[in-house]
Interface confidence: medium
């Protein structure tokens, strides 16, 4: 059903004479950030940003890709290069060296150059690079981590560690070498390496001792904490901190980020990653709007500022699943958070990037008609004489054969969250991509994100925009409404 | 080790009525897929409808507006009420779980022994 203005030219001539207006009156916003929010979609490439989209204005009832994502308001956009140092393709521990420390490092290794390497705790002293979150810290101002994944994976562990193995979640994971030579679990280093105000997200098991009974699933023996050290790392944390509250569900949460006694929040949702948005229960875990909201209205207190760092996390594991409705649901979970995160703040003192680690072989294609479903098959057979899905993957679980071919897909099928869209590859996951990713900016300084980029520029224009270590000096006009 | 325990199968006319239900019992992750999937004769096993843990409900176009499923967390049972039945819808159905142990690529998936419908008069 296509609208009927679009078969007239005027339609679009005065669409794009709107944007060329908005575009000539577009000013850079010229002193420095207050606050900084880095919004990190994990495996966000631009196939799932468009594939986003679609999906967001299908659920508004709309035809689809005419919608605009939160993100896509955002006046700046580069593309960033997500290679790693040792490989074309990267993981999400190289990356957030990438694009939180400022220094590129090697696959499966977090916050140290290129010089460590992986799984060899003796290359780690000497090599740690230090985040923009931390340089913010040291700056005075407030500091939060926001993810839908385990607080300590790899993309938040960014911002605050230093490890050579991104899988040392705690110290059960951890070589009993590696122990003796001194390197912590990421665990330990999220609540001992830097004060962080707010932390949110799932991964309760790697903060107390094994065996621990979870609040959750006290009869769930796999939910159960991990420390071998005997540790209670929560317990740790609230000793620190007169102000510190420690929360595990929503309710919790809800009250906590509105009493003004609490300084600071650690949140822990699930004794792993949190759910997928299509299976959380909103009554007991906060979304990731939520987590966002509560993150900001902490954080705000401080007159001289924050950085927040907000993970849509389990955008790739959707992908390496090969179900692309989870993956995409998540991104509109994301952009949702985006959107209220840019009604609480202001674009004049906030910077505010939005961009991904990495991209995955996830492709969208075969040309479906304009408003099918965005989880539906493509118009036409393929050439074995079967339907096919529009969106489908380079490699992954999803290849099946049946009686040695390529199984038939139905609409009713390929519309289900749980289905496996279909690939060219055998493998256990689906992996990475290694295409340019896009980078979305607003605020003070945002005109600096242009072109194509290094992945560690975003760091630097970061800390150049809010004056941070090492651009102190950074010569800019104060923020609006502020006197110093 | 998690059992589905399907019921409510039988023989009913066109245009009746009949409500399936299936219990999951054992170790069960309270984050999951519950739904219905049926084979009709020489056919091939196809999906009915589905309900996640979070509230998400997915049906198959061909049972749109006359079946509809329902779940209950606290007792790990789903159902499905069918409604209109017709001819084509005779088929043996079978419940399905589906699990996210949090571990990528890493469902659990569990099948009931499934249970007939045969809609003829």
């Known amino acids: 059903i296509i609208p009927v203005e679009e078969e007239n030219p005027d339609f679009w001539n005065r669409q794009a004479a709107e944007a060329l207006g908005a575009a000539k009156k577009l000013q850079p916003i010229q002193t420095a950030a207050k606050n900084l929010i880095i919004f990190l979609g994990d495996g966000m490439g631009v196939s799932t940003v468009t594939a986003a989209r679609i999906l967001k204005g299908q659920k508004e009832d709309k035809l689809g890709p005419e919608t605009p994502l939160a993100m896509d308001h955002f006046p700046y956009v580069a593309l960033s290069k997500t290679y790693s140092v040792d490989k074309h393709v990267p993981d999400s521990a190289a990356t957030a060296t990438a694009y939180l420390c400022g220094v590129k490092g090697n696959f499966q290794t977090i916050g140290l150059s290129a010089a460590a390497r992986y799984n060899q705790c003796n290359t780690t002293r000497g090599n740690e690079v230090v985040s923009v979150m931390n340089r913010a810290k040291k700056a005075g101002k407030s500091v939060g981590v926001v993810t839908t994944t385990r607080v300590q994976h790899a993309s938040p562990a960014g911002a605050y560690a230093h490890t050579v193995n991104r899988n040392w979640y705690s110290d059960a994971n951890m070589p009993g070498s590696a122990r003796r030579e001194g390197c912590k679990d990421i665990a330990t280093q999220l609540i001992s390496n830097m004060d962080i105000d707010v932390i949110l997200g799932g991964g309760r098991k790697y903060m107390f001792r094994m065996g621990a009974p979870d609040p959750e699933y006290p009869h769930d023996y796999s939910q159960d904490g991990t420390r071998m050290d005997g540790k209670n790392l929560v317990q740790e944390w609230l000793a620190k901190q007169q102000g510190a509250r420690y929360v595990w569900n929503r309710t919790e949460l809800m009250q906590a980020s509105l009493d003004p006694s609490v300084t600071h929040l650690m949140g822990l949702f699930e004794p792993g990653d949190m759910k997928y948005e299509i299976h959380r229960d909103p009554t007991l875990d906060p979304s990731l709007m939520e987590m966002t909201e509560a993150a900001l209205r902490l954080l705000s207190r401080n007159p001289r500022g924050f950085f927040l760092f907000v993970e849509g996390g389990r955008i790739d594991h959707g992908h390496h699943e090969s179900r692309a409705y989870r993956a995409l649901t998540e991104a509109v979970m994301f952009d949702d958070a985006i959107e209220r995160a840019g009604q609480l703040t202001s674009e004049e003192d906030t910077l505010t990037l939005v961009t991904a680690d990495h991209s995955h072989v996830f492709s969208f294609g075969a040309y479906p008609l304009r408003g099918s479903s965005i989880f539906g098959l493509a118009p036409g057979k393929a050439q074995d004489r079967k339907a096919y899905t529009a969106l489908l993957y380079g490699n992954g679980p999803g290849y099946v054969l049946k009686d040695g071919a390529r199984p038939d897909v139905t609409e009713s099928e390929s519309g289900s969250p749980e289905y496996r869209q279909q690939a060219a590859v055998p493998l256990d996951e689906e992996t990475h991509a290694g295409e340019d990713v896009a980078v979305f900016a607003r605020g003070p300084q945002a005109h600096l994100v242009h072109g194509v980029q290094e992945q560690s520029f975003i760091a630097h224009v970061m800390a150049f925009a809010a004056c941070l270590e090492p651009y102190t000096a950074c010569d800019l006009a104060p923020p609006a409404g502020t006197t110093d | 080790q998690v059992q589905l325990v399907e019921s409510g199968g039988g023989l009913v006319q066109p245009g009746g009525s009949l409500r399936l239900s299936c219990a999951a019992s054992?170790?069960?992750?309270?984050?999951?897929?519950m739904g219905w999937y049926r084979q009709a004769p020489g056919k091939q096993r196809d999906l009915v409808a589905v309900?996640?843990?979070?509230?998400?409900?997915h049906y198959a176009d061909s049972v749109k507006g006359r079946f509809t499923i329902s779940r209950d967390n606290a007792k790990n049972t789903v159902y499905l009420q069918m409604n209109s039945l017709k001819p084509e819808d005779t088929a043996v159905y079978y419940c399905?779980?589906?699990?996210?142990?949090?571990?990528?690529?890493?469902?659990?998936?569990?099948w009931g022994q499934g249970t007939k419908v045969t809609v003829s008069s």
């Open positions: 399905n779980l589906v699990v996210p142990y949090g571990m990528i690529a890493g469902d659990h998936d569990y």
């Open positions: 054992g170790s069960i992750f309270s984050v999951n897929t």
């Open positions: 309900a996640t843990s979070g509230g998400t409900i």
